[in-house]
Interface confidence: medium
């Protein structure tokens, strides 16, 4: 079965649907499941063999205004002796999320949905090695 | 996008808070980025804490398909390619925002929803105490 994209009128339009101007959609930004319970292990960013730091980015014209980004601390991975092993690579793991962007045009304001790529952490991988023929 | 007149007294009186309900343009900015992690990188196979990707599909949500990670092993893969149980593979979880059709089945009416996804796995040193 074809999965509808945002804005596609694949669904039968029920009578209860609110009227929406053409080319736009109604978005309630009161978040469902605001208090999710993350059961992630403690301090994994420091204890990982591919450790990372967090940076908070702030933009008052974005909702949510605060987005946390991770950055890998090393190019290599940390070995059992606590030293960096450059025969392995620390690489970022990324995930897309949606944000609402507020744009000012003179004395008017418009809202735009935007996909943002968030780096959530890092993992240690074996490098891809290309051998010369 | 759809423009909404600003409060009287523009440009000085600016509401710093977002309104509860907004009209947004149907075109999503950066919409065509690659959403299939299997195609975007092979880290899930090359990692010392490899993971499998599971397709989570929901037509009442945008994006309708989200890929979820599940660590393959309890331990991590060592240099010999074996699972080392002295290290732990743990999931990296992230809260993301998606759109939920509200009321259900409506084509152009949504509400933001926060969902928890497991994005990948990382290898960590376990926390253990040794008896003196």
């Amino acid at each position: 079965r074809k999965i509808p994209k945002v804005g596609h009128t694949f669904f039968q339009k029920p009578e209860s649907c609110p009227p929406v101007p053409g080319g736009s959609m109604k978005l309630d930004i009161g978040i469902i499941n605001e208090n999710q319970r993350v059961s992630m292990s403690r301090n994994i960013e420091s204890r990982s063999t591919s450790p990372w730091n967090y940076t908070v980015t702030w933009d008052p014209n974005r909702y949510p205004s605060e987005v946390v980004q991770a950055q890998c601390r090393n190019l290599g991975c940390i070995n059992a002796q606590g030293k960096e092993d450059i025969s392995m690579n620390s690489v970022p793991i990324q995930q897309e999320t949606l944000v609402v962007r507020r744009k000012h045009q003179g004395c008017s304001v418009s809202f735009q949905l935007e996909k943002v790529l968030v780096t959530v952490g890092c993992t240690c991988v074996t490098p891809v090695i290309h051998h010369v023929q | 996008g759809i423009t909404i007149p600003r409060n009287p007294g523009c440009p000085n009186s600016e509401d710093k808070n977002f309104p509860r309900t907004v009209m947004v343009n149907l075109n999503i900015h950066n919409r065509n980025t690659n959403t299939n992690p299997k195609r975007s990188s092979d880290y899930y196979n090359r990692s010392t804490s490899p993971w499998n990707l599971h397709r989570n599909e929901d037509p009442e949500r945008y994006p309708s398909v989200i890929w979820e990670a599940k660590c393959r092993h309890l331990g991590c893969i060592n240099a010999d390619g074996n699972v080392d149980y002295h290290m732990n593979s743990v999931p990296i979880q992230q809260e993301i925002l998606v759109l939920r059709r509200e009321p259900p089945h409506c084509p152009n009416s949504f509400r933001l929803e926060k969902i928890l996804v497991s994005v990948g796995c990382t290898c960590v040193t376990p926390i253990v105490h040794h008896v003196a």
């Epitope: 499941n33 999710q36 319970r37 993350v38 059961s39 292990s41 403690r42 994994i44 | 599971h54 989570n56 979820e68 599940k70 309890l74 732990n88 743990v90 999931p91 979880q93 928890l116 497991s118 960590v124 376990p126 926390i127 253990v128 105490h129 040794h130 008896v131």
Partner: antibody, heavy 124, light 111 residues
Framework: EVQLLESGGGVVQPGRSLRLSCAAS????????MHWVRQAPGKGLEWVAV????????YYADSVKGRFTISRDNSKNTLYLEMNSLRPEDTAVYYC?????????????????WGQGTTVTVSS | QSVLTQPPSASGTPGQTVSISCSGR????????VDWYQQVPGAAPKLLMY???IRPSGVPDRFSGSQSGTSASLAISGLQSEDEADYYC???????????FGSGTKVTVLG
Amino acid sequence: EVQLLESGGGVVQPGRSLRLSCAASGFIFSNYGMHWVRQAPGKGLEWVAVISYDGSNKYYADSVKGRFTISRDNSKNTLYLEMNSLRPEDTAVYYCAKVGASGDYYYSYGLDVWGQGTTVTVSS
Amino acid sequence: QSVLTQPPSASGTPGQTVSISCSGRQSNIGRHYVDWYQQVPGAAPKLLMYYDSIRPSGVPDRFSGSQSGTSASLAISGLQSEDEADYYCATWDDSLGGYVFGSGTKVTVLG
């Protein structure tokens, strides 16, 4: 031998309190997450609470949240469950159980060691 | 009402294979690994399987586990009289922020 021994059960009136203890032996208690699980007469298993190895993280079932408190004393190798505002539906055998792997895990290796249980009866 | 659904009962004659299903959702089985427990009447539960399909030492290889999507299953091959017990699946649930048990399945060995 790895052992868990629960105590503190008994008959109590609704609204009253009770404190269960679980004495651990045969393993490094401070390395392991610990759970409380209960079983009402003739019913299935119901998870109650979990505490991380160091006591920093605690999770509770919705049915006991705000009334029960899980805690541990690693120096005494003992797990506790403080039960307040008890209700008749809290009547059950209460088991403490150990997580199968040390460190972070709350569940991934299953609950590999269980006590024999202590009975709590809430009745007027 | 458990968030992990199991059939209330299953039965078989000695030597047969019995399968028990455990149905959940994305926030539990879809994201976390499943454990299985065996409980004989009057005794504490015993860990039978963890991480979907790993048997702890001492558990016979007649027991096997598998998982697909948001469901898991436990199979008991070469059924024996001592397998008569209640079986529970369990896993973590991110939405509830806790460990959850299935409703339980009573396995009966006939004849």
